[in-house]
């Protein structure tokens, strides 16, 4: 278990021409809030698919009124972090969607109007317990700067929050074969209680004797990679997964990555993602300081004056990895809209637009929205030769004239009540039930039927759906 934390640093106009108009005005002051949605793996799922790792909504930012004639500055932000608790292992690879919402504070009776200003998405590798990772994402003419990290909740530790720490039984040292739990030096790593042979890299357990697999791995000991290719094996598809089992040993079997590196398959071989202080094909080179020049591709090395202290590589645009060793395939994120062709020039991305589209990301349809109106605070989105409305929360249809009722499908189980709150669907559970959709009965002794309740979740707790 642990928490993914997101800190928004700024939201404002991006560099370059075509600065966006301020979203607020003296006539219509507004404030911002943010929504983050996390999904495990490097999935390219639609924005509407479930936030399987979790989601969070920020507080509202300060009210902002545009100064007439002034360009849009960085807009005032809500205080605090967005926190997304996760109950199981941290998957290591994840996809995110961060949405910037505008709340208009006009004098409309019955409350404000909400509209989506910008949505950014990405796919990242991240080890739990590591430092804050900084990121910049652009959506149209807007730029969002943010940092994120994943941290484990005690007693969990490790890059996937699957190792456990326990207080020391003796004051001086840990038991045989057990290491101190950095950074909790007064605690010791708990003995492994998983099923014998359970892969330490790809499996984890929450109860003694079990072996649960991280995404991409299967088999009783989580040693078999799941292939996403079509099933050519005579064994056919595995009933345990939606993919297929690759017969025989995979390139990552036995984990060829040394020094705690994690292995991932590539089409022809494998790739090791090394912890700080190690590099090389199999993370076998160690004791590195900045004097050794560990940062590739023009990365800037910081810290690490002696072999015992870690160095950090600050990578130039287009490169990533703990040693800036990996070229970012920025075109894989499909930044060019409306069928534009993506060209990664190394120093910059270029989009070659189809006829009828323009803009750095081919986001402008040259005349789709001319004279079009979206009702109820919706905004017109150009694309595909026909205008489309991005509707405010609670509205739907081609022109946002239809009221959308997220409760129509009766999502709250066991007699729970569903409310169409502006922040998303809300369930109020009937007595005796709990959970996001009131799906878990509360046992008479007060325990729930959940395998393990997430931190802070009590019987009768509501859950918000975003």
């Amino acid at each position: 278990a642990g928490v993914f934390e997101l800190q928004i640093h700024s939201f404002g106009p991006g560099p370059g021409p075509g600065a966006p108009r301020s979203p607020c005005s003296a006539r219509l002051p507004c404030r911002l809030f943010f929504r983050v949605c996390l999904k495990p793996g490097l999935s390219e799922e639609a924005a509407e698919s479930p936030c399987a790792l979790g989601a969070a909504l920020s507080a509202r930012g300060p009210v902002y009124t545009e100064q007439p004639g002034a360009p849009a500055p960085d807009l005032p932000l809500p205080d605090g972090l967005l926190q997304v608790p996760f109950r199981d292992a941290w998957p290591g690879t994840f996809s995110f969607i961060i949405e910037t919402w505008r709340e208009e504070l006009g004098d409309q009776i019955g409350g404000p109007a909400w509209s989506l200003l910008a949505r950014v998405a990405g796919r990242r590798r991240l080890a739990a317990g590591g430092p804050w990772a900084r990121d910049i994402q652009r959506a149209g003419a807007w730029e969002l700067r943010f940092s994120y990290r994943a941290r484990c909740e005690p007693p969990a530790v490790g890059t996937a929050c699957t190792r456990l720490c326990r207080p020391r039984s003796a004051p001086s040292r840990c038991g045989p074969g057990l290491r101190p739990c950095a950074p909790l030096e007064d605690e010791c790593e708990a003995p492994l209680v998983c099923r014998a042979g359970c892969s330490p890299e790809h499996g984890f357990c929450e109860q003694p004797g079990e072996c649960r697999c991280l995404e991409g791995w299967t088999g009783p000991l989580c040693t078999v990679p799941v292939s996403t290719s079509s099933c050519l094996s005579p064994r056919g598809p595995s009933s345990a997964t939606t993919g297929c089992l690759v017969p025989g040993p995979g390139p990552c079997d036995g984990n060829p990555c040394a020094n705690g590196g994690s292995c991932s398959e590539t089409p022809r071989s494998f790739e090791c993602t090394c912890p700080r202080g190690f590099y090389g094909l199999r993370c076998e080179v160690s004791g590195v300081t900045c004097a050794d020049g560990p940062c590739f591709n023009g990365g800037l090395c910081v810290g690490g004056a002696d072999p015992d202290s870690a160095y950090i590589c600050h990578c130039p645009p287009g490169f990533q990895g703990s040693n800036c060793e990996k070229r970012v395939d920025r075109c894989s994120l499909q930044p060019c809209r409306n069928g534009g062709l993506c060209l990664d020039l190394g120093h910059a991305l270029r989009c070659r637009c189809r006829a009828g589209f323009a803009g750095p990301r081919c986001e402008h349809d040259l005349d789709d929205c001319a004279g079009r109106a979206c009702a109820n605070g919706g905004t017109c989105v150009e694309g595909g030769g026909a205008h489309r409305c991005s509707c405010a929360l609670g509205f739907g249809g081609r022109d946002c004239r239809e009221r959308a009722d997220p409760c129509a499908a009766r999502p709250c189980a066991h007699g729970g009540r569903c409310y169409a709150h502006f922040s998303g669907l809300v369930c109020a559970c009937a007595p005796g039930y709990m959970g996001a959709r009131c799906e878990f009965p509360v046992h008479p002794d007060g325990a729930s039927a959940l395998p393990a309740a997430p931190p802070g979740l009590r019987p009768g707790d509501p859950q918000r759906y975003l």
């Epitope: 009722d405 009540r417 569903c418 409310y419 009937a430 509501p462």
Partner: antibody
Framework: QVQLKESGPALVKPTQTLTLTCTFS?????????MGWVRQAPGQGLEWMGT????????DYASWAKGRVTITADESTSTAYMELSSLRSEDTAVYYC???????????WGQGTLVTVSS | DIQLTQSPSFLSASVGDRVTITCQST????????LSWYQQKPGQPPKLLIY???NLEIGVPSRFSGSGSGTDFTLTINSLEAEDAATYYC??????????FGGGTKVEIK
């Protein structure tokens, strides 16, 4: 624009039944929320009477109101009703209808209607 | 029956003062934070200030803030202004779809 408006008799006699109407505009009964009735005796605090949940038209009442209060709603006319039987002078109050769309708070209120119970 | 007790029931303070009103429930509110605060002036319906214990309603000045969870909650007015003279009510929502209001706190400007 979204609003609620209560209406009903200003004066009723003891032992009679009071029927109040709450008409709303700018939103539909077909979406899911609670329509509640709250009253306030002169110089006193707010007192919850009961609610109707528009998702399934189930009702909940304050313990003192069970058996005396009946809340109903009619989607076709965008109206909610509250009946209070066996009136006594202590029922003299301003009666409000209010809406909850989640997290248990009333974000939208009517202006209220004063009902006096007197012979 | 569930009781919500507000204290004090009356307070007099000067413009610029920091004012704190507490609300104590005999039962934990649903979800531990389904508690709201309202302001009411004579002849007007209540106006929502805070929902879900600490969320400021749109258009409400930032000098108002709420905190607390479970059974104990607080409304704070950071720098009292003349227009804040009113009666303030807390209201909880409870398992079983039950609502309850506190008795109210009348705030007067000295």
């Amino acid at each position: 624009q979204v609003q609620l408006k209560e209406s009903g008799p200003a004066l009723v006699k003891p032992t009679q039944t009071l029927t109040l109407t709450c008409t709303f505009s700018g939103f539909s009964l077909s979406s899911s929320y609670d329509m509640g009735w709250v009253r306030q005796a002169p110089g006193q605090g707010l007192e919850w009477m009961g609610t109707i949940y528009t998702g399934d038209y189930s009702t909940d009442y304050a313990s003192w109101a069970k058996g005396r209060v009946t809340i109903t709603a009619d989607e076709s006319t965008s109206t909610a009703y509250m009946e209070l039987s066996s009136l006594r002078s202590e029922d003299t109050a301003v009666y409000y209808c209010a809406r909850n769309t989640g997290y248990g708070y009333f974000g939208l209120w009517g202006q209220g209607t004063l009902v006096t119970v007197s012979s | 029956d569930i009781q919500l007790t507000q204290s004090p029931s009356f307070l007099s303070a000067s413009v610029g003062d920091r004012v704190t009103i507490t609300c104590q429930s005999t039962e934990s509110v649903y979800g531990s934070d389904w508690l709201s605060w309202y302001q009411q002036k004579p002849g007007q319906p209540p106006k929502l200030l805070i929902y879900q214990a600490s969320n400021l309603e749109i258009g409400v000045p930032s000098r108002f803030s709420g905190s607390g969870s479970g059974t104990d909650f607080t409304l704070t007015i950071n720098s009292l202004e003349a227009e804040d003279a009113a009666t303030y009510y807390c209201q909880g929502y409870y398992s079983g779809y039950i609502y309850a209001f506190g008795g109210g706190t009348k705030v007067e400007i000295k």
